[in-house]
C-alpha cells in the first residue's frame, strides 16, 4: 500500500471550487460531497454561485469528478498502478484540453490535494471558440451522462501520467456531441509516486436535481473502477 493510499480507507470529504470563463462568460461553481475509494463511489452536489451556469452541467462533469480520480476503486491486483492515491496528500496538478467536435474547447488546470482531512479540487477553466448557438452555449445537451472508459498510461519523463478519452454527450435532437479529452497529471510533491502500466477506469455517472435547491445546481453520483490489467501468472497458479 502506498502512503497516500492509507488516506482513502474510509469516507473522505470533498470540496470543489471552479472559476470559469467561456467565450467571455465568467462563472464560479462550488461543490461538496464525499468519496469512498473502497467502492469507487462519489456523491457530490454543485452550485453555480454566480447565477445561471452559461454552459450545460454535463460538460463540466469530467472537470469536477473525473478530477478526483483518487477515489477510483483499484482492485487488489492493480493497487501498484494507482498513481492518483500515491501522489497524496501533497496531490497532483491535472491539466486538460477538451475539444468539443465542431465547436470550441475547454482548457483546465486543477490542483487536487488534501487540505486538512478534506480532498480539495481547485480548478481554473478557460473556454474559447464556442458557437453562441451551438450545443454548448445553446444549451442543447440532455441532462444525463453516459458510461465511459478513461485510458491511462505512464509519463515517465514528467513523473506522472497521460490520460485520453472521448466523452459522448447526448443532444436533445437524439444525436451525440463528442468531447475529446487530453489529460496530464503531475505530482505536486517530490515524494515517490506509482507509475502505472497501461490500464483504464470504467466510469458510471448519474445526474439528478435536488428538488429543494433554489440555485442552479447539479447532483452527481458516480462509480469508478480500474480495470484492464489481468492477474499475474503466479496469481493464476495459486
Amino acid at each position: 500500500m502506498s502512503k497516500g493510499e492509507e488516506l482513502f480507507t474510509g469516507v473522505v470529504p470533498i470540496l470543489v471550487e471552479l472559476d470559469g470563463d467561456v467565450n467571455g462568460h465568467k462563472f464560479s461553481v462550488s461543490g461538496e460531497g464525499e468519496g469512498d475509494a473502497t467502492y469507487g463511489k462519489l456523491t457530490l452536489k454543485f452550485i453555480c454561485t454566480t447565477g445561471k451556469l452559461p454552459v450545460p452541467w454535463p460538460t463540466l462533469v469530467t472537470t469536477f469528478s473525473y478530477g478526483v480520480q483518487c477515489f477510483s476503486r483499484y482492485p487488489d491486483h492493480m493497487k501498484q498502478h494507482d498513481f492518483f492515491k500515491s501522489a497524496m496528500p501533497e496531490g497532483y496538478v491535472q491539466e486538460r484540453t477538451i475539444f468539443f467536435k465542431d465547436d470550441g474547447n475547454y482548457k483546465t488546470r486543477a490542483e487536487v490535494k488534501f487540505e486538512g482531512d478534506t480532498l480539495v479540487n481547485r480548478i481554473e477553466l478557460k473556454g474559447i471558440d464556442f458557437k453562441e448557438d451551438g450545443n454548448i452555449l445553446g444549451h442543447k445537451l440532455e441532462y444525463n451522462y453516459n458510461s465511459h472508459n478513461v485510458y491511462i498510461m505512464a509519463d515517465k519523463q514528467k513523473n506522472g501520467i497521460k490520460v485520453n478519452f472521448k466523452i459522448r454527450h447526448n443532444i436533445e435532437d437524439g444525436s451525440v456531441q463528442l468531447a475529446d479529452h487530453y489529460q496530464q497529471n503531475t505530482p505536486i510533491g517530490d515524494g515517490p509516486v506509482l507509475l502505472p502500466d497501461n490500464h483504464y477506469l470504467s466510469t458510471q455517472s448519474a445526474l439528478s436535481k435536488d428538488p429543494n435547491e433554489k440555485r442552479d445546481h447539479m447532483v452527481l453520483l458516480e462509480f469508478v473502477t480500474a480495470a484492464g490489467i489481468t492477474h499475474g501468472m503466479d496469481e493464476l497458479y495459486k
Epitope: P13, L15, S30, G31, E32, K45, I47, T49, D210, N212, E213, K214, R215, H217
Partner: nanobody
C-alpha cells in the same frame, strides 16, 4: 453538536426594520435563515457561506434583507428592511458543518428554535 439561539424578533410596522441574531455555540460552516409562515412550508430566505465569499437571497427579499456573519463571535445576522406583511413568519437559523452555501433544508445539520417576526 452546535446549538443555535435566535434573538431579535418582534412586532414591527410595515416598512420598518428588524435585525435578527443567531449565536452558535461553536464554529460552523455555511449559515442561513429560513422562515415558516402558518400553514406553509419552511423556506430558505438568505445565507452566507463559511468562507464569507458567497451570499444568496430568494427573490422576494432581495434588496431588502442582508445576511452577514461574525466568525469571532460565531454569530450570523439577518438585517430586514422595508418589511411587508407577507414577511410575517417564524424565522429559523440553520448551520452546516461544511462551508458551501446550499438552499435546501436537507443540507443543514443544526437548527435553532426560531424567533417570531410579525409585520
Amino acid at each position: 453538536d452546535v446549538q443555535l439561539v435566535e434573538s431579535g424578533g418582534g412586532l414591527v410596522q410595515a416598512g420598518g426594520s428588524l435585525r435578527l441574531s443567531c449565536a452558535a455555540s461553536g464554529p460552523t460552516g455555511a449559515m442561513a435563515w429560513f422562515r415558516q409562515a402558518p400553514g406553509k412550508e419552511r423556506e430558505f430566505v438568505g445565507g452566507i457561506s463559511g468562507s464569507e465569499t458567497d451570499t444568496y437571497y430568494v427573490d422576494s427579499v432581495k434588496g431588502r434583507f442582508t445576511v452577514d456573519r461574525d466568525n469571532v463571535k460565531n454569530t450570523v445576522y439577518l438585517q430586514m428592511n422595508s418589511l411587508k406583511p407577507e414577511d410575517t413568519a417564524v424565522y429559523y437559523c440553520a448551520a452546516r458543518r461544511r462551508i458551501t452555501l446550499f438552499t435546501s433544508r436537507t443540507d443543514y445539520d443544526f437548527w435553532g428554535r426560531g424567533t417570531q417576526v410579525t409585520v
